[in-house]
Amino acid sequence: AMHVAQPAVVLASSRGIASFVCEYASPGKATEVRVTVLRQADSQVTEVCAATYMMGNELTFLDDSICTGTSSGNQVNLTIQGLRAMDTGLYICKVELMYPPPYYLGIGNGTQIYVIDPEPCPDSDF
């Protein structure tokens, strides 16, 4: 299996945005790569978003996706937005080298994303 590295922990910003790098050790010269972000929480795994891209080109997520990303060589910079405290969990990066054959699959160990909802602003007396 292909090795995929990602940070162990990331703290989302106060605006609910978390970014992390997913890096894969490509055994071949892939031209088309598929990246999927999976969320694991309470032993349930769900797909957060997925994108296919040509090496050297931008990642294209669906228009309504909460993910955006850029690629550089064997690194993918992923950003997940609109996160709330309830979205805290382990976010796993799955990389598939689709074409040309052979097919390679790599799954990272996951990035624990912590999301803290911002405190509401106190009423002001001014």
Epitope: T31, E32, T52, Y53, M54, M98, Y99, P100, P101, P102, Y103
Partner: antibody, heavy 118, light 107 residues
């Protein structure tokens, strides 16, 4: 039910051109790579060309590179094969096939016959 | 290109017989070996992919085995409807290549 229906075959003179079409239904076309495979009369199967689901990747058999062009229109659920500079040895039944991992062709159309003869 | 060699090119067996077809690749193709069935005058159909996984709707009398360069398609009990030409195909590297086919007939 997965259905693939080819059209566009016919008789053409050497050096001529043809455009084959394949209409797909019964599955989400934009999720799958597609291939063209041909079979000369009384012969075996020969892979011709492949296009990935979003058309990012396109590949051809060595003999067809430069003469054939594979393309797709996901909005129309259609696959195409533009064949130029046709030769007698291109005479065959041309099948369009859906390609799923692991690079197997899991569903095939009924085929369209291309005859190159003067 | 990876060459795929099938043997025998044709065989004749009785209904109920165990039939074995072999396919040899010119280099290691890992798990990327698929088998197709083409009945006379019909369209090819995927039988087995990833060496041994049956495609949907394929009867359990068909099985595949092997690794690396040597692979086998087995029909455990030949039925009249199994009369066809069988092709192996490698998906390990482009161009994808097929074996020459094995024609199976009933005695």
């Amino acid at each position: 039910e997965v259905q693939l229906v080819e059209s566009g075959g016919g008789l053409v003179k050497p050096g001529g051109s043809l455009r084959l079409s394949c209409a797909a239904s019964g599955f989400t076309f934009s999720d799958y790579g597609m291939a063209w495979v041909r079979q000369a009369p009384g012969k075996g199967l020969e892979w011709v060309a492949f296009i990935s689901n979003l058309a990012y990747s396109v590949y051809y058999a060595d003999t067809e590179t430069g003469r054939f062009t594979i393309s797709r229109d996901n909005a129309k659920n259609s696959l195409y094969l533009q064949m130029n500079s046709l030769r007698a040895e291109d005479t065959a039944v041309y099948y369009c096939a859906r390609s799923g991992l692991p690079y197997a062709m899991d569903y095939w159309g009924q085929g369209t016959t291309v005859t190159v003869s003067s | 290109d990876i060459q795929m060699t099938q043997s025998p090119s044709s065989l004749s067996a009785s209904v109920g017989d165990r039939v074995t077809i072999t396919c040899r690749a010119s280099q290691d193709i890992s798990n990327y070996l698929n088998w197709y069935q083409q009945k006379p005058g019909k369209v090819p159909k995927l039988l087995i992919y990833y060496i041994s996984r049956l495609h949907s709707g394929v009867p359990s009398r068909f099985s595949g085995s092997g690794s690396g360069t040597d692979f086998t398609l087995t029909i455990s009990s030949l039925q009249p409807e199994d009369v066809a030409t069988y092709y192996c195909q490698q998906g390990r590297m482009l161009p994808w290549t097929f074996g020459g086919g094995t024609k199976v007939e009933i005695k």
